[in-house]
């Protein structure tokens, strides 16, 4: 029952005469383990007996012997899942069905595999892709349904008899689907591969070749092309005819279109193999090449110079710089076509022929302004002497030159005044067209090349000026030495550099930071009225009267500038004090007698202090001494004190009588 | 312009004497105090004392009084400060400067500009 | 004398930050008779403020000063890369005049 077995072999085996057969084989039944296998060859079932009948090649007895004489046959398998086979050597009268009986223990089967044994080794078949196209890699496969272990075999390319150099990776299978030996090359065919023999060829160990496979290669290519010319020189002369062949050396498949191209651009109606150049012209000087195309593709021959010989043709100069600029390096070119290049050179400047120069190109390292003018050439080589062009202009260019600046104003310049300044040249290209000066300040222009300062300033020291085109030329710098009163005065004071104290010698400085001119004269003032004409004002020992408001003078020809006025302060204890009464010095008892300090001090006082007639301090510190109700024991005389951060001052001594009252008086 | 040009540095001994100098230039060099000031290594500034070159009239910080000596030549622009016996700890920077300032109002500023560069006295035994 | 007392001893910005440098004096400064100065390493101090908050000739308007009595700032809006130096305060209003111990401005 078929349901009951799984059986997995090739199928067919093939071999040849001393060769071997591996025979790859698994199985399962229903039931587990295999009790009997017998390999038959060629086996026929007899109904009578109900069994199958045959040459045994292998039986694996009870006690697991093998029939004598049967070492050639092999069972490699197992009692569970393994079928495996081998024929070592095999024999062509093995070809026919091996029958593999298989007993279980509640099943039987009969497994057939063909065995196909030629007499000499059969070829390898050579597998190529459906189409072979140049400088397109494929993939070349040589296939031998053959493997078996004990049998080493080798395939081997070649084209046209030689071996081929790219390696080839061989693959075997031995496996229960398929059992072959396979030998893989990667190609890149190239179309001079067209029409050649590739050959895979089977050997044995011993490199003996035991059969061969052959393929002719069909590479489809885009045409091989070559070109000739005739005659064979492609330099010619103008006039002369030329014909160009394109031949096709190769195309596959054959060629369909032709076309002819000159510089890389088609020929109109030349669609042969030959292009024909009746009395060729200079412009028919270039590059050929013919285009053929096939269903590949199309191909473009190498390229043929075709120079047409000529003498110059008028010329023209080329300036590498016009207008140039003076100084510059400028080069001359004589542009005059011809083929043969000219071999020889005359150069004109302004007409007159320049000595010395014969060369296609010249330079002038330094361009002055008299090189400016027309400049022309003529070109010659072997067929003659060409035309001189018209010429070409050279415009040399320069800054202005000699630029001098005037002060146009009488001198001496004071400040304030207005200066009027005028800027010169000598010569100029191209024309000048602006003015520059320096410094920059938002003065006017009136007319080109003049400057008005106006309201000019202290420290405008120096102008300078520039006469500008593509390029400004500057004057030297003008001094215009302008006058002016001093400047930045100021009161400096040098002596005490602390607070002035009554009695300290006092210096004060003034200090001016510049005049033009240099000569000057001092003025001190104090409160508007003058006081001294040095630079220096010295008090020996200042007194509280000489402070007050000071500011000095400085003063030259131009003008005289005065400092920002100064408080001079003195600082002084208390002074002149006295003692004053409201009420007058007489007072009647039971009144209020009030006594004030006053006093003239700097700092002002701080603090008082009272004393009587006996010189005793009386509990008072105020500027006013406040006696309420006074009475006739107070009568007497009376003193203050004042104290600022300077020191001490007192006051003389100031009599109150105080007398009684008509009240005391009626009393006694 | 106004300028002040200091000696150059000096390396003495503990115990010796030295002078250095600062010359004026550019403006009235006896019209202006000149200020002393040191710099110790690494540390700030410390007014010495100053001189009016005009009469020679000097005022010392009293942490140095007793210690230097400032004197001018107005004649010839210079301020000079002077030790009679260094000690290892006048190595310093020393700086002359001068006094400027100006009245105005009620105040009068005082400053120190322009300063000289420098003269390092390095004392060391 | 007058102490002169500088905070912070050392001051960390990046340029174009805004540096606030203060300066206390021990006792009244009168007439507000402060300077500043600034001193780069190698070099002599340079004159940038006196009267408090009066600008020396040819100082940038980015330094200015401010304070009276005890109390001074000095203040440099944007910090340029030459900025970066010693700044002292000077008081010259009490005998003798003295410095603060400075404040140094570094790059952060």
């Known amino acids: 029952d078929s349901s009951k077995w799984n059986i997995e072999h090739p199928g067919t085996i093939y071999a040849w005469e001393g060769a071997c057969v591996w025979v790859p084989c698994t199985y399962r039944v229903l039931d587990g383990a295999l009790e009997t296998f017998i390999l038959f060859h060629n086996p026929e079932y007899n109904q009578n007996m109900s069994k199958f009948e045959g040459t045994r090649l292998y039986e694996n007895t009870k006690d697991g012997k093998l029939p004598s004489g049967q070492k050639r046959v092999q069972f490699l398998g197992n009692k569970i899942n393994n079928c495996t086979l081998s024929i070592h050597p095999v024999h062509v009268n093995d070809s026919g069905q091996l029958g593999l009986r298989m007993v279980s223990k509640t099943e039987k089967w009969m497994e057939r595999i063909h065995l196909n044994v030629s007499e000499r080794p059969f070829p390898p078949r050579i597998q190529l892709p459906p189409k072979l196209q140049e400088s397109q890699e494929v993939t070349l496969t040589c296939l031998l349904n053959f493997s078996c272990y004990g049998y080493q075999i080798q395939l081997q390319w070649l084209l046209e008899g030689v071996p081929m150099r790219q390696a080839a990776v061989t693959s075997t299978s031995l496996s229960t689907k398929s059992v072959f030996t396979r030998s893989e090359l990667k190609f890149s065919p190239q179309w001079s591969h067209h029409g050649k023999i590739v050959t895979c060829e089977l050997h044995d160990v011993d490199g003996k070749v035991l059969s061969e496979d052959m393929v002719q290669l069909n590479v489809k290519h885009t045409p091989k092309l070559t070109i000739e010319v005739t005659p064979n020189e492609t330099t010619v002369r103008k006039g002369d005819s030329v014909t160009m062949t394109c031949k096709v050396n190769s195309s596959n498949p054959e060629y369909t279109t032709v076309s002819w191209l000159k510089d890389g651009i088609p020929l109109k109606e030349q669609n042969t193999l030959m292009l024909t150049l009746h009395k060729v012209t200079k412009s028919q000087s270039g590059r050929y090449c013919c285009r053929v195309s096939n269903d590949v593709g199309p191909a473009t021959s190498e390229k043929v110079f075709l120079q047409v010989q000529y003498a110059p043709e008028s010329s023209r100069v080329q300036i590498s710089q016009s207008p140039a600029v003076e100084g510059s390096e400028v080069n001359f070119l004589c542009i005059s076509p011809a083929n043969p290049l000219p071999t020889n050179y005359t150069w004109y400047h302004n007409g007159k022929e320049v000595q010395g120069r014969t060369e296609k190109q010249f330079q002038i390292q330094k361009i002055l302004p008299w090189h400016a003018g027309t400049y022309s050439c003529e070109a010659g080589n072997i067929l003659g002497i060409g035309e001189r062009g018209p010429g070409t202009e050279l415009d040399v260019q320069y800054p202005p030159k000699k630029v001098t600046m005037v002060i146009e104003n009488p001198t001496p310049i004071r400040e304030g005044d207005t200066v009027t300044l005028s800027c010169n040249y000598s010569s100029s290209n191209p024309i000048v067209n602006h003015y520059e000066w320096r410094p920059r300040g938002a003065w006017e222009e009136p007319s080109l090349g003049v400057l008005k300062i106006q309201n000019i300033g202290w420290n405008n020291t120096a102008v300078a000026c520039a006469a500008c085109n593509n390029w400004c030329s500057w004057a030297s710098p003008v001094t215009l030495n302008v006058l002016y009163a001093p400047r930045g005065v100021r009161v400096r004071k040098i002596k005490p550099l602390s607070e002035i104290h009554s009695g300290n010698s006092v210096s004060l400085q003034c200090d001016f930071s510049s005049s033009h001119p240099k000569e000057v004269q001092f003025f001190w003032e104090k409160n508007g009225s003058l006081l001294g004409k040095e630079s220096q004002l010295n008090f020996d020992s200042i007194s509280p009267e000489d402070a007050g408001s000071y500011s000095c003078w400085v003063n030259n020809s131009i003008g005289q500038t005065a400092s920002k006025a100064w408080t001079l302060e003195v600082l002084y204890a208390p002074r002149r004090l006295r003692v004053s009464m409201s009420q007058g010095n007489q007072v009647m008892e039971g009144k209020t007698a009030t006594l004030i300090c006053e006093s003239d001090a700097n700092p002002p006082v701080y603090s008082y202090a009272w004393f009587d007639w006996n010189n005793q301090s009386l509990p008072y510190s105020g500027r006013m001494l406040r006696l309420e109700p006074v009475k006739v024991q107070h009568s007497g005389a009376y003193w203050c004190q004042g104290t600022n951060r300077v020191g001490k001052g007192h006051s003389p001594l100031i009599t109150l009588t105080v007398y009684y009252s008509p009240q005391t008086i009626g009393r006694r | 312009e106004v300028q002040l040009v200091q000696s150059g540095a000096e390396v003495k001994k503990p115990g010796e004497s030295l002078k250095i100098s600062c010359k004026g230039s550019g403006y009235n060099f006896a019209t202006y105090w000149i200020a002393w000031v040191r710099q110790m290594p690494g540390k700030g500034l410390e007014l010495m004392g100053i001189?009016?070159?005009?009469?020679?009239?000097?005022t010392y910080n009293p942490s140095f009084q007793g210690q230097v000596t400032i004197s001018a030549d107005k004649s010839i622009s210079n301020a000079y400060l002077q030790w009679s016996s260094l000690k290892a700890s006048d190595t310093a920077m020393y700086y002359c400067?001068?006094?400027?300032?100006?009245?105005?109002?009620?105040?009068?500023?005082?400053?120190?500009?322009?300063w000289g560069l420098g003269t390092l006295v390095t004392v060391s035994s | 004398e007058i102490v002169l007392t500088q905070s912070p001893g050392t001051l960390s910005l990046s340029p174009g930050e805004r540096a606030t440098l203060s300066c206390r004096a021990s006792q009244s400064v009168s007439s507000s008779y402060l300077a500043w100065y600034q001193q780069k390493p190698g070099q002599a101090p340079r004159l940038l403020i006196y009267?408090?908050?009066s600008r020396a000739t040819g100082i940038p308007d980015r330094f200015s000063g401010s304070g009276s009595g005890t109390d001074f700032t000095l203040t440099i809006s944007r910090l340029e890369p030459e900025d970066f130096a010693v700044y002292y305060c000077q008081q010259y209003g009490s005998s003798p005049w003295t410095f603060g111990q400075g404040t140094k401005v570094e790059i952060k």
């Open positions: 009267g408090a908050s």
């Open positions: 001189i009016y070159p005009g009469d020679s009239e000097t």
């Open positions: 400067a001068r006094v400027g300032g100006y009245c105005s109002g009620t105040s009068c500023h005082n400053w120190f500009d322009p």
